[in-house]
Amino acid sequence: QYYQLSNTGQDTISQMEERLGNTSQELQSLQVQNIKLAGSLQHVAEKLCRELYNKAGAHRCSPCTEQWKWHGDNCYQFYKDSKSWEDCKYFCLSENSTMLKINKQEDLEFAASQSYSEFFYSYWTGLLRPDSGKAWLWMDGTPFTSELFHIIIDVTSPRSRDCVAILNGMIFSKDCKELKRCVCERRAGMVKPESLHVPPETLGEGD
């Protein structure tokens, strides 16, 4: 009798352990599914937000702070105040950002469009030569690739020309103490899916 009870107890424990194992597996599976769904939701939210942003040039779903421009994976701000290269660097840092970095052709096209000025204002980029006459480096230490653009050495600058500015789509090396406008960039945050919520009463109004 005792043996049978004990055996039944063992069976119950085994069954419970099995069920616990199954439940644990189900939970893991649900967690994986949840991560995948969250990823999909994030992807869809970003795609939709980009479409909304593209249409208006602004949208509350934008992962960029108000007045900052969303391009690619980054947020940009083109400021009108003129500062030395170093002052721009510290100014951007105070804005929780870094100076403009041009990684690819599309970024150069964007920067050229945004910074173009009939009054020939130029903008500092985050490109410099820490040692005069040596290699050009971006602020984060990555080397500059000359395929991207040609740096015109500005012979009119009286002192060392170790900082790089963009002027109407052209790139010049300039004296770092010259005053130019600042461009700051920071990584775009995540699009919040809830920021895409459209109140039902606005549905069907235009496109």
Epitope: N54, G57, K69, W70, Q105, A112, S113, Q114, E147, H150
Partner: antibody, heavy 117, light 107 residues
């Protein structure tokens, strides 16, 4: 994907006006300028100027100052080229092209304007 | 204004040939030069900027070189789809100007 879609061909009489549209999609319209390029039949390409899509400020090449007007409707991501007091020599294909005045990665398909009495 | 002069104005070649088109600027434009390909009834297609940097999707048989005032576009081995008109264009400030074009025809 990025597209610039232009309005259809136009046949106009001398002295009339024409408005060509260029609708952009697949990117943020105000992030990139818009240029206009003319190509007369059997001829080469001529840069007419550009419009800053942020400020709406147009810039015209010398040969295109006066009768040519660039404008925008950012709410529908569209740039326009208007030509007034049309002349026979305005007969050409007009292209819009995205970007600051530099190189042009993306072009519209072109709009042929024929001016004939 | 900067004048761009292309040579030759037309050129006959065969599939597999190596072809070079030259472009000369009236003053130094450093490396601020772009190349385009245009087929009849179509918009120009962007090939190269910065004198030598290939646009994405452009076959590696196309290459650009030069700086200052003298530039070349080379097609290493002509393919049937390469027969078209080619234009150079400076992007060293405004006004932008194009070369008069080089028509590449089948021999």
């Amino acid at each position: 994907q990025i597209q610039l879609v232009q309005s259809g061909s136009e046949l106009k009489k001398p002295g009339a006006s024409v408005k060509v549209s260029c609708k952009a999609s697949g990117y943020t319209f105000t992030n990139f300028g818009m240029n206009w390029v003319r190509q007369a039949p059997g001829q080469g390409l001529e840069w007419m100027g550009w419009i800053n899509t942020n400020t709406g400020e147009p810039t015209y090449a010398d040969d295109f100052k006066g009768r040519f007007v660039f404008s925008l409707d950012t709410s529908v991501s569209t740039a326009y080229l208007q030509i007034s007091s049309l002349k026979a020599e305005d007969t050409a294909t007009y292209f819009c092209a995205r970007g600051a005045p530099a190189w042009f990665t993306y072009w519209g398909q072109g709009t042929t304007v024929t001016v004939s009495s | 204004d900067i004048q761009m002069t292309q040579s030759p104005s037309s050129l006959s070649a065969s599939v597999g040939d190596r072809v070079t088109i030259t472009c000369r600027a009236s003053e130094s434009i450093y490396s601020y030069l772009a190349w385009y390909q245009q087929k009849p009834g179509k918009a120009p297609k962007f090939l190269i900027y910065n004198a030598k940097t290939l646009a994405s999707g452009v076959p590696s048989r196309f290459s650009g070189s030069g700086s200052g005032t003298d530039f070349t576009l080379t097609i290493s081995s002509l393919q049937p789809e390469d027969f078209a008109t080619y234009y150079c264009q400076h992007h060293f400030g405004t006004p932008l100007t194009f070369g008069q074009g080089t028509k590449l025809e089948i021999k």
